[in-house]
Interface confidence: low
């Protein structure tokens, strides 16, 4: 009679996790008695997965009717698979005897395990950072086998191309992590943007993962300032406004010097929201030309989201007629017009 | 049908570099690594290193390390496998080979870039 | 690294003969064993991986077998396209390898 063969006929086994996997074997002969084994890897560290003869194995269940002499079936199923019991399993015919020896191994079955990554955590920088600049945005996942993954990056729908992403561990492992790094260049127009990680993996059947940052947690949009008058029907009275434009976030306080001393503090509250997510914000100051007899400096300082002031300053005659006169004592960007919600803040001298 | 079209033949002064590409079609090009094997005239096949297209994680032979660089274009799903230095020795074709991930073997390849070294 | 020995490098066989050529792996590689025909001026072709598992659309007269060390491809029925160069390849672990080829040639 020819001598027994141990047969595994799956060279692998894919599962995923939280499934069974059942791993088969077959031998072509009874002969010789003796139980069969499974083991997890080989060699002297390998792992005794289930004993036919003795051993209790509550994960294990045997495919056949293992007690019965004429059996010949040694396939077993393993529940609730995790990435941890990813590796090569052996069947192993043993040999009667005390103790039992080692008689003939199966060619192996590697039984890998599908694990999902959890959803991709995308994390900003801790400060925020104004248009122009770049700014790096990290996204990671955990968890998941086998070890291949992609990972892209989208900023409102268009794919990002500066990232650097790495997969931990290099080596072999149960289950693995991805970290990516993406810089992304603000605009002024990013208050209503998104970035958006995307994790594509074999086990998510085409439907990748996606973690996203609003990049309005991120951008800072300086305001801009324009300071104007317009006469009121009184003669000593000139109303000058403070028009500040295209500002995020929300935050802003504004003063008012006259000649350099503080007339008036107020914090912005009901703003204007353009389409593009910015504020639009404007103050009034009714100044009495009578109560002046020289030329009156009158500055409009805006410090916005914790940031150093910036302001506009506009010449007031007293001695002619009132005409417009600017001059800037802060560099600003130039804010497109808007509607205005306007605040009528009366201030007599 | 799943295919591999590499570039054309290629002749290269000693010291230079070259850079063969590798155009796949027919098949999820992120699913698989692409190797690249080479065969000077009238001798065996030399494995090179792979590029696991999905990604990016790249293994080179020690004999090619620092000379051989591989890269991908998921979007193009194209492969590049660029030689720099390059002796009268390196004068042969260049094969890339689509491999799977668990047993690396080479199901599908390229038919092959011929690159001459000479001065 | 792991070496791979081929014999013979060449032999000569007539159609029909049954043809086998060996693969020695310098250590054990399990069944991580390829086996790739070429003909001159082509690429290879693969025929077997996983030491004995046959590639789609490759004829059944191909067979190969063994493990761990030790791995043979056997061609029963030489026919005239099988006229070929074969090559072994290990996939065990990097820097993969071939063997050195064995030359089929018509006696």
């Known amino acids: 009679e020819e001598e027994l063969q141990v047969i595994q006929p799956d060279k692998s086994v894919l599962v995923a996790a939280g499934e069974t996997a059942t791993l088969r074997c077959t031998a072509t002969s009874l002969i010789p008695v003796g139980p069969i084994q499974w083991f997890r890897g080989a060699g002297p560290a390998r792992e005794l997965i289930y004993n036919q003869k003795e051993g209790h194995f509550p994960r294990v269940t045997t495919v056949s009717e293992s007690t019965k002499r004429e059996n010949m079936d040694f396939s077993i199923s393993i529940s609730n698979i995790t990435p941890a019991d990813a590796g090569t399993y052996y069947c192993v015919k043993f040999r009667k005897g005390s103790p039992d020896t080692e008689f003939k191994s199966g060619a192996g079955t590697e039984l890998s395990v599908r694990a999902k990554p959890s959803a991709p955590v995308v994390s900003g920088p801790a400060a925020r950072a104004t248009p122009q600049h770049t700014v790096s945005f990290t996204c990671e996942s955990h968890g998941f086998s086998p070890r291949d993954i992609t990972l892209k990056w989208f900023k409102n729908g268009n794919e990002l191309s500066d990232f650097q992403t790495n997969v931990d561990p290099v080596g072999e492992s149960v289950s693995y992590s991805i970290h990516s790094t993406a810089k992304v260049v603000l605009t002024r127009e990013d208050v209503h943007s998104q970035v958006i990680c995307e994790v594509a993996h074999v086990t998510l059947q085409g439907d990748p993962l996606r973690g996203t940052a609003n990049l309005s947690e991120t951008i800072r949009v300086p305001p801009t300032l324009e300071v104007t008058q317009q006469p009121v029907r009184a003669e000593n009275q000139v109303n000058v406004t403070c028009q500040v434009r295209k500002f995020y976030p929300q935050r802003l306080q504004l003063t008012w010097l006259e000649n350099g001393n503080v007339s008036r503090t107020e914090t912005a509250s009901t703003v204007t929201e353009n389409k593009d997510g910015t504020y639009n914000w404007m103050s009034w100051l009714l100044v009495n030309v009578s109560a002046h007899r020289d030329d009156v400096k009158l500055t409009c300082q805006v410090e916005h989201d914790g940031q150093p002031a910036v302001s506009k300053s506009h010449d007031l005659k007293v001695s002619a007629h009132p005409k417009e006169q600017g001059s800037n004592t802060a560099a600003e960007n130039t804010g497109s017009n808007e509607r205005h919600h306007h605040h009528h803040h009366h201030h007599h001298h | 049908q799943v295919q591999l079209v590499q570039s054309g033949a290629e002749v290269k002064k000693p010291g230079a570099s070259v850079k063969v590409s590798c155009k796949a079609s027919g098949y999820t090009f992120t699913s698989n690594a692409m190797h690249w094997v080479r065969q000077v005239p009238g001798q065996g096949l030399e494995w090179m290193g792979w590029i696991k297209a999905g990604n990016a994680e790249i293994k080179y032979s020690q004999k090619f390390q620092g000379r051989v660089t591989i890269t991908r274009d998921t979007s193009a799903t194209t492969a590049y496998m660029e030689l720099s230095s390059l002796r009268s020795e390196d004068t042969a074709v260049y094969y890339c080979?689509?491999?799977?991930?668990?047993?690396?073997?080479?199901?599908?390849w390229g038919k092959g870039t011929t690159v001459t070294v000479s001065s | 690294d792991i070496q791979v020995t081929q014999s013979p490098s060449s032999l000569s066989a007539s159609v029909g003969d049954r043809v086998t050529i060996t693969c020695r792996a310098s250590?054990?590689?399990?069944?991580?064993l390829n086996w790739y025909q070429q003909k001159p001026g082509k690429a290879p072709k693969l025929l077997i991986h996983?030491?004995?598992s046959l590639q789609a659309g490759v004829p059944s007269r191909f067979s190969g077998s063994g493990s761990g060390t030790d791995f043979s491809l056997t061609i029963n029925s030489l026919q005239p396209e099988d006229f070929a160069t074969y090559y072994c390849q290990q996939s065990y672990s990097t820097p993969l390898s071939f063997g050195g080829g064995t030359k089929v040639e018509i006696k």
């Open positions: 080979a689509r491999g799977d991930y668990y047993y690396y073997y080479m199901d599908v």
């Open positions: 250590q054990s590689i399990s069944d991580f």
């Open positions: 996983a030491a004995s």
